[in-house]
């Protein structure tokens, strides 16, 4: 029987009865907040073999092992995770061992076993046999291993029953409890599962099977389950569902889940029955069950109840995140703010259509309107008094409307009005008239030629670059010396540069009037020698990175026919040279036979160029004779090693006062003082633990149902 869509057992241990007939839990299983210690021995759920999402255990008093509850739990698929984890065991005060001796596979996600004061048999489980990658596992704050004395079956009698594997260079027996070994399949099975008798399962089986080489005898399926059979793909007219089974169209059409109740129902896309069309797709009609690709960003219509939406802060802009069509009017009134241009672009950058008017007034923080980077149509269905559908008044720092070389904007109805924008050149406004199709609609007073652009360099000459030289972290550029009509008007140059992975940046990107600017700025004085071309060395750059660079001449505000003359260059794109890559990450090695090592790693975080190959070097190390000096099968306390690695838990460093001299045979050394890097790592670790704990509490503490 499939149980779902997630089972939450809390407060009363008798709720466990809900699991009685479940073979698969389609969703998560929470067992938590049972504060009264109970006797769980009468509760046993041998039918449960698969959890499709995650298993979470939290503060269940009296529960000492999971093995009796779930003796046949074989697979946790991790289709959805709890904060990246498929198995979470947290603050289980009485848990002595995990004991899930039939758990063979956690398909996705890591494990988090934390703050379980009595929990042992953690170091005896080889999680790499269950998970693909163990590097994200978090096993912290449980009973210290040296207090556990974990012994696998038969070890005391010197007839060990369990198999051995290597973890962290330690070759040891693997078991779940004092009487349950960790099951391993014969190497002849390869990646396949096996029966209790070590016969290989069918390749479509996952975890285990009741008969060899039979796709109807699997305990769980590697890919999908359909009509009693494990299949590599869902048959025709059936669709993947929840990552593990095949369902028909009717099932998909009828799903009404608490999570998706507000949507228009599940959809079928790319052979899968899913809650919503994936990113980049939209329903083929409002009640359709099928998805089609969006042309550009997927449409999202947003409407303002009061007809006019005032954008006076980042918070108000946030309401428009993801909107592509805004039904109503936009009133933009941004007087101040931090990093305002990029914040506005983040929240309003997808708007393509405004059905009413757009009014920008007293927005002294704005330098450009490029944050509305996808606006292509103002319908003007509603207009301001005087029939204006685009109204720009008193914006003290507005210099650019949009980059008209890369912008098509249509104003379908209504006129434009511009006044008291002292840094906005009239030529910029005239250009907008042409692009938007409003030329001829405005009357003489609608675009004021006296108080728009009165404090701007509106007649610009072009500065030309003369040379560029690059190294791995430097760029040297020079440009023609600019000669204004009166040479005394030229004060200096300003070079603007920034990383630009794509050749699509504009001068006003991320720039606002409150100091935020995505461009780095460097001032360059005029060379004293009139024949030397000005130039600059930009250093401290990243290797193999494309930068955008432009130069502006800083001139005196010389008025010529009521306009100031200035000069600037085009934007130049230039890439630094390649360099040595940073070190490969997460290097792991494991032995899979007596003559082989398997080494895995992730690419470097900074490739600094196009990676073409890796070099792997290895060398033989002498065997550590120390390993043979103690009988590890005896239950005596294992001797403390004669060196410290500087990572001992604080609470464990109590035995050795700091007066002991290190070295020789004088006894254990003291822990060395922590380096700054170690302190920082510890700080981050503590922070991470806090974040997880907050996430856990926020997720599971909910108001009591009615």
């Amino acid at each position: 029987e499939i149980c779902g869509p997630g089972i939450d057992i809390r407060n009363d241990y008798q709720q466990l009865k809900r699991l009685e007939n479940c073979t698969v839990i389609e969703g998560y299983l929470h067992i938590l907040l049972i504060s009264k210690a109970e006797d769980y021995r009468s509760y046993r759920f041998p039918k449960l073999t698969v959890i499709t999402e995650y298993l979470l255990l939290f503060r269940v008093a009296g529960l000492e092992s999971l093995g009796d509850l779930f003796p046949n739990l074989t697979v946790i698929r991790g289709w959805k995770l709890f904060y990246n984890y498929a198995l979470v065991i947290f603050e289980m005060t009485n848990l002595k061992d995990i004991g899930l001796y039939n758990l063979r596979n956690i398909t996705r996600g890591a494990i988090r076993i934390e703050k379980n004061a009595d929990l042992c048999y953690l170091s005896t489980v080889d999680w790499s046999l269950i998970l693909d990658a163990v590097s994200n596992n978090y096993i912290v704050g449980n009973k210290p291993p040296k207090e556990c004395g974990d012994l696998c079956p038969g070890t005391m009698e010197e007839k060990p029953m369990c198999e051995k594997t290597t973890i962290n260079n330690e070759y040891n027996y693997r078991c779940w409890t004092t009487n349950r070994c960790q099951k391993m399949c014969p190497s002849t099975c390869g990646k396949r599962a096996c029966t209790e008798n070590n016969e290989c399962c069918h390749p479509e089986c996952l975890g285990s099977c009741s008969a060899p080489d039979n796709d109807t005898a699997c305990v769980a399926c590697r890919h999908y389950y359909y009509a009693g059979v494990c299949v590599p793909a869902c048959p025709p007219n059936t669709y993947r569902f929840e990552g593990w089974r095949c369902v028909d169209r009717d099932f998909c059409a009828n799903i009404l889940s608490a999570e998706s109740s507000d949507s228009e129902g599940f959809v079928i896309h790319d052979g899968e029955c899913m809650q919503e069309c994936p990113s980049g797709f939209i329903r083929n009609g409002s009640q359709s069950m099928y998805c089609i690709p969006c042309e550009g960003p997927c449409p999202k219509v947003c409407e303002e109840e009061k007809k006019t939406k005032t954008i006076d802060s980042v918070t108000s802009a946030q309401m428009l995140q993801g909107c592509t069509i805004f039904k109503g009017n936009l009133l933009i009134n941004i007087r101040r703010g931090n990093n305002i241009a990029s914040e506005l672009e983040n929240f309003m950058g997808l708007i393509e259509v405004v059905t009413g008017y757009v009014k920008i007034r007293h927005s002294h923080a704005l330098v450009s309107l490029s944050f509305l980077k996808n606006l292509r149509l103002i319908l003007g269905e509603e207009q301001l008094e005087g029939n204006y559908s685009f109204y720009v008044l008193d914006n003290q720092n507005l210099q650019q409307l949009w980059d008209w070389d890369h912008r098509n904007l249509t104003i379908k109805a209504g006129k434009m009005y511009f006044a008291f924008n002292p840094k906005l050149c009239v030529s910029e406004i005239y250009r907008m008239e042409e692009v938007t199709g409003t030329k001829g609609r405005q009357s003489k007073g609608d675009i004021n030629t006296r108080n728009n652009g009165e404090r701007a360099s509106c007649e610009s000459d072009v500065l030309h670059f003369t040379s560029t030289t690059t190294s791995k972290n430097r760029i040297i550029i020079t440009w023609h010396r600019y000669r204004p009509p009166d040479y005394r008007d030229l004060i200096s140059f300003t070079v603007y540069y920034k990383e630009a992975p794509f050749k699509n940046v504009t001068e006003y990107d991320g720039q606002d009037a409150c100091g935020s600017n995505s461009w780095n700025m460097v001032d360059v004085d005029l060379p004293p020698n009139k024949d030397v071309e000005p130039g600059i060395l930009l250093h401290g750059l990243k290797p193999w990175t494309q930068y955008a660079v432009y130069v502006k001449a800083v001139t005196l505000t010389m008025v010529e026919n009521d306009h100031i003359r200035g000069a600037k260059s085009e934007i130049l794109y230039i890439r630094t040279n390649a360099s040595v890559p940073s070190i490969p990450l997460d290097v792991l090695s494991a032995s899979n036979s007596s003559s082989q090592l398997i080494v895995k790693w992730n690419p470097p975080s900074l490739p600094n160029g196009n990676l073409s190959y890796y070099i792997v070097r290895w060398q033989r190390q002498p065997q550590d004779g120390y390993l043979y000096r103690h009988n590890y099968c005896s239950k005596d306390k294992i001797p403390i090693r004669k060196y410290a690695d500087g990572t001992i838990d604080i609470e464990e460093v109590t035995e050795n006062p700091k007066t002991e001299v290190c070295g020789g045979e004088k006894g254990p050394c003291c822990a060395c003082p922590k380096t700054e890097a170690e302190k920082q790592a510890e700080k981050e670790e503590a922070e991470y633990r806090k974040v997880f704990e907050n996430f856990l509490h926020n997720s599971i503490f909910v108001p009591r149902p009615e």
Epitope: E1, I2, C3, G4, P5, G6, I7, D8, R18, N21, C22, G27, F251, A253, N254, I255, L256, S257, A258, E259, S260, S261, E264, G265, S286, Q287, P705, E706
Partner: antibody
Framework: QVQLQESGPGLVKPSETLSLTCTVS?????????WNWIRQPPGKGLEWIGY???????NYKPSLKDRVTISRDTSKNQFSLKLSSVTAADTAVYYC??????????WGQGTLVTVSS | DIVMTQSPLSLPVTPGEPASISCRSS???????????HQWYLQKPGQSPQLLIY???NRLYGVPDRFSGSGSGTDFTLKISRVEAEDVGVYYC?????????FGQGTKVEIK
């Protein structure tokens, strides 16, 4: 895999309250869907009584609204029907059923309730 | 309440012959979202009802293709192209577009 099972007294006296419980296995009643009661008087057609949704909201047939209450016990994964002031006309087979976005997909096997003194 | 009226109320059929049942609603059962939540259920003797057709014409997976549904607005039809002995029972139409949800009074199909 989802199963619904009605339970309750088969005989109720006139003017008393009829109480039935539907136990659901294989799906959590808070996880989604609308959980319905439907009845069928002997030899007659089906009549929808009302539902309780996954979030606890109710909808009842207006002509029965004053007498009917559908509630739930999430810890037991059950929902219940209470019909007050019953008469002989309330004698019927009572079904519990699950309704999704479009149709009833699972039904209980039904339980006969007779109203008689 | 929307009244669903079925006809005929009794339908004697010969195996292998076609059959048709009509269902008329007292007002349009098109939901505000554009869908028509009209279904046909079959109740075999001593059993709970089982779904045959949903949203007017969608045949449930596993239902034989001799069953088909059609109609719109207020008039709906269930057709059985060739009746088989296992098709006997009471057929109900149902509307779930407007609360209160309502069933038709049922059409009893029996073998002649």
């Amino acid at each position: 895999q989802v199963q619904l099972q009605e339970s309750g007294p088969g005989l109720v006296k006139p003017s008393e309250t009829l109480s039935l419980t539907c136990t659901v296995s294989g799906y959590s009643i808070t996880g989604g869907y609308l959980w319905n009661w439907i009845r069928q008087p002997p030899g007659k057609g089906l009549e929808w009584i009302g539902y309780i949704s996954y979030d606890g909201t109710n909808n009842y047939k207006p002509s029965l609204k004053d007498r009917v209450t559908i509630s739930r016990d999430t810890s037991k994964n059950q929902f219940s029907l209470k019909l007050s002031s019953v008469t002989a006309a309330d004698t019927a087979v009572y079904y519990c059923a699950r309704y999704g976005r479009v149709f009833f997909d699972y039904w209980g096997q039904g339980t006969l309730v007779t109203v008689s003194s | 309440d929307i009244v669903m009226t079925q006809s005929p109320l009794s339908l004697p059929v010969t195996p292998g012959e076609p059959a048709s049942i009509s269902c008329r609603s007292s007002q349009s059962i098109v939901h505000s979202n554009g869908n028509t939540y009209h279904q046909w259920y079959l109740q075999k003797p001593g059993q709970s009802p089982q779904l045959l057709i949903y949203k007017v014409s969608n045949r449930l997976y596993g239902v034989p293709d001799r069953f088909s549904g059609s109609g719109s607005g207020t008039d709906f039809t269930l057709k059985i192209s060739r009746v088989e002995a296992e098709d006997v029972g009471v057929y109900y139409c149902f509307q779930g577009s407007h609360v209160p949800w309502t069933f038709g009074q049922g059409t009893k199909v029996e073998i002649k």
